[in-house]
């Protein structure tokens, strides 16, 4: 007799999950020698033991702290670049300045970037048809759990100037409900955070409007300041260009407005 | 810098099939997410397919889904892309690039970081 599964409104786990957390381990401790230490096979475990036979909106981020305490990792806290709902240009812009670091150039970034999981209750299968929808579903299933656990964690490690990207082509720039309107933010460490810089980034061609005057980053402004953390922000109207003057700062193109 | 040498191109007749290489020398593909991209004449350069750091997940564009296929050899050291049922849309210069990270989607062609290498030419003609 079939087994009833619950259907959830999110697509299901990613194919070949476990296969592409340990090959992605073992890949990130080849890359990073810092953390050649780690073991692979009990970091797939303590990721595995998080949410199989869990309930899958039921899911906290003390099931995550075995993980955590494995992937413990040590970025340059003054180097740390945030980014919301504009990911790949992120992650463009570390490809070519390559001392900054995204969640996703950690560890437990890197295993999980782009994957989507979960189980079942009281059994040891992983969803492979589907998985929970944090709007249709639940707030508390294994990725959003994860990506909010590991996001205040980096969050708490930075120090110094740190910057944020965030998508200009959206309605709503700053968007509280997002991870880092939601997580990242609030975790941000006063003591240890001077500046919160971001940078808007600017989707159409002719567009010349000054973003940073937009009233969420007005709100994204009176948030930092409130927390003691001075604010600033800049427009990147030309993202194209301001990734080649970034790889090539001396062209002279690069000293006008990008 | 990273750099790419491709090669395989050539001229085919529609309905043709073709294999590009996409090879590194110095250090180590496996590495890296790759994406192979084409430059039509006049045309803006699109991502076409990439294939991730494990080599288990895949992502193609529109315009190639179930003709193309991207893979990696065992050893690491090239990325191919094998392309079946050619069309004279298919013309263009070819290029492979790679990303910092695990997942496809650092490799957005449209606001690419990459130094591209010269590319391999593909022609599509009766």
């Known amino acids: 007799v079939p087994r009833w599964r619950q259907q959830w409104s999110g697509p299901g786990t990613t194919k070949r999950f476990p296969e592409t957390v340990l090959a992605r381990c073992v890949k990130y401790t080849e890359i990073h020698p810092e953390m050649r230490h780690v073991d692979c096979q009990s970091v797939w475990d303590a990721f595995k033991g998080a949410f199989i036979s869990k309930h899958p909106c039921n899911i906290t981020e003390e099931d995550y702290q075995p993980l955590m305490k494995l992937g413990t990792q040590t970025v340059p806290c003054n180097k740390i670049l945030l980014w919301s709902r504009i990911k790949d240009l992120a992650h463009q812009f570390t490809q070519v300045q390559r001392d900054m670091f995204t969640l996703e150039d950690t560890l437990l970034g890197y295993l999980a970037d782009d994957l989507t999981w979960c189980g079942e209750f009281n059994t040891s299968k992983i969803n492979y048809q589907s998985c929970p929808d944090w709007r249709k579903d639940c707030s508390n299933n294994p990725v959003s759990v994860f990506w909010k656990t590991v996001s205040r964690r980096f969050a708490e490690a930075a120090c110094d100037v740190v910057h944020v990207m965030l998508n200009g082509s959206r309605s709503k720039i700053f968007d509280k409900n997002s991870t880092f309107g939601s997580v990242e933010v609030h975790n941000l460490q006063p003591e240890k955070v001077q500046t919160l810089e971001a940078w808007v980034i600017h989707g159409g061609r002719e567009d010349s409007r000054d973003l940073c005057q937009d009233p969420t980053i007005k709100e994204l402004e009176s948030i930092i300041s409130k927390r003691n953390i001075q604010f600033s922000c800049k427009n990147i109207y030309r993202p194209d260009k301001f990734l080649q003057c970034v790889k090539n700062p001396e062209d002279s193109s690069c000293t006008s407005e990008i | 810098q990273v750099q790419l040498v491709e090669s395989g191109g050539g001229l085919v007749q529609p309905g043709g099939s073709l294999r590009l290489s996409c090879t590194a020398s110095?250090?180590?593909?496996?590495?890296?997410?790759i994406g192979w991209f084409r430059q039509a004449p006049g045309k803006e350069r699109e991502a076409i397919a990439c294939?991730?750091?494990?080599?288990?997940?895949?992502n193609y564009g529109d315009s190639v889904s179930g003709r193309f296929t991207i893979s990696r050899d065992n050893a690491g050291t090239t990325v191919y892309l094998q392309m079946n049922s050619l069309e004279a849309e298919d013309t263009g210069i070819y290029y492979c690039?790679?990303?910092?990270?695990?997942?496809?989607?650092?490799?957005?062609?449209?606001?690419?970081?990459?130094?591209w290498g010269q590319g391999t030419q593909v022609t599509v003609s009766s």
């Open positions: 690039a790679p990303a910092r990270y695990a997942a496809c989607s650092a490799l957005d062609v449209k606001l690419s970081f990459t130094s």
């Open positions: 294939i991730d750091i494990t080599g288990f997940h895949t």
């Open positions: 110095g250090f180590r593909l496996d590495y890296y997410a």
